[in-house]
Amino acid sequence: VPRWRQQWSGPGTTKRFPETVLARCVKYTEIHPEMRHVDCQSVWDAFKGAFISKHPCNITEEDYQPLMKLGTQTVPCNKILLWSRIKDLAHQFTQVQRDMFTLEDTLLGYLADDLTWCGEFNTSKINYQSCPDWRKDCSNNPVSVFWKTVSRRFAEAACDVVHVMLNGSRSKIFDKNSTFGSVEVHNLQPEKVQTLEAWVIHGGREDSRDLCQDPTIKELESIISKRNIQFSCKNIYRPDKFLQCVKNPEDSSCTSEI
């Protein structure tokens, strides 16, 4: 008799998930000498231990603690770039501006970026068919809890001036329900963080509006100010030119506003 399997609303585990995690770990530790000491086999074992044989709606931050411990990494606390709904540009930026870091530039963020995973209660199987959707099924699923955990730790580590890249093309430029809005904003430490500087990325070529005056940005400013952290905001009118100028700051066209 075939065993009944829970059907979730979200996509199943990414194909070749264990191999992907291990290979990404190997690749990362080869590129980053400060992480050479990391045993990637142990990292996989800890990752697996967080969700295998557990109900995929019953995952806790505690489940990920062994993995967090193995992936402990010191990034310069004043070089942190947060982002919301504009991941690709944030990553393109840190690929050029090598001294700044997004969460996905750290080992744990790099391991899990774009992946989906979940197990099944009481079996050692990985579920490649479906995984819980945050909205339709449950919020305490393996993927959501992982990102909540690493995002909280990343925000807690930040200091001095913290930058955040926001998508100016969205109806809610700042969304309280995003990971940035629900986790990272509330875990910046006022005793360490002096300023949160938002970079609002414009989508349209001819869009000259000051999106720093957007009501959702004002809402973000209010939340941040109440936490005794200063807030500043910049419009990035031309993201393509912005990246070009990060690559070639001495270019004569880079003195004008971008």
């Epitope: 990414t14 290979a23 770990c25 190997v26 086999q41 970026d113 992946l115």
Partner: antibody, heavy 123, light 111 residues
Amino acid sequence: QVQLVQSGAEVKKPGSSVKVSCKSSGGTLRNYVINWVRQAPGQGLEWMGRITPFLGESESAQKFQNRVTITADTSINTAYMELSSLRSEDTAVYYCARETVGATAADWYFDLWGRGTLVTVSS
Amino acid sequence: QSVLTQPASVSGSPGQSITISCTGTSSDVGAYNYVSWYQQLPGTAPKVLSYSNDHRPSGVPDRFSGSKSGTSASLAISGLQSEDEADYYCAAWDDSLNNYVFGTGTKVTVL
């Protein structure tokens, strides 16, 4: 610097078997996915199969499924490809290649190759 | 064993640009799978030039660039040099065969 070091050339009789080795030097084989690819003289590349030592899993192309055995001994950092019931068409250079992840999820490619082992099947 | 189709040979003069095509099906190149490209110099093992359709490993000159559209992929080589004389292969995972498929190979000659 990781290298894949392969065993030397072999001459085999039709109907016999050959076992080619691939040693990971400077890196832990257990952490890699090792593939086997062959190339007949003057021909293109043909994928035979792969092994993921840390999962203890191997798979092979349908064409070779009954004749190829891919194994690994992680204690000596070595992967093996054994091909049985050899025929003259199996004369080829056999490469081991490390498979690694690409830029996005579910994306893989061969980033490191051994120098190849020439296997000649002749009566 | 299904293979991806490439032109048998492509040639160009030094400094010129050439493009090598790689045509597959909906289960390999056209699927949610990625194309990688390999250069094989005479008597040596293949070496990766491009992966994830359009990414270049470090150490590979930016004269080489990969791209993909639909069920086809291509490798462009600009500023052709004599050391580019080699065989070039594309590769992709085939979901229906459950194995990697390589291109038929293209011999590049620098005139």
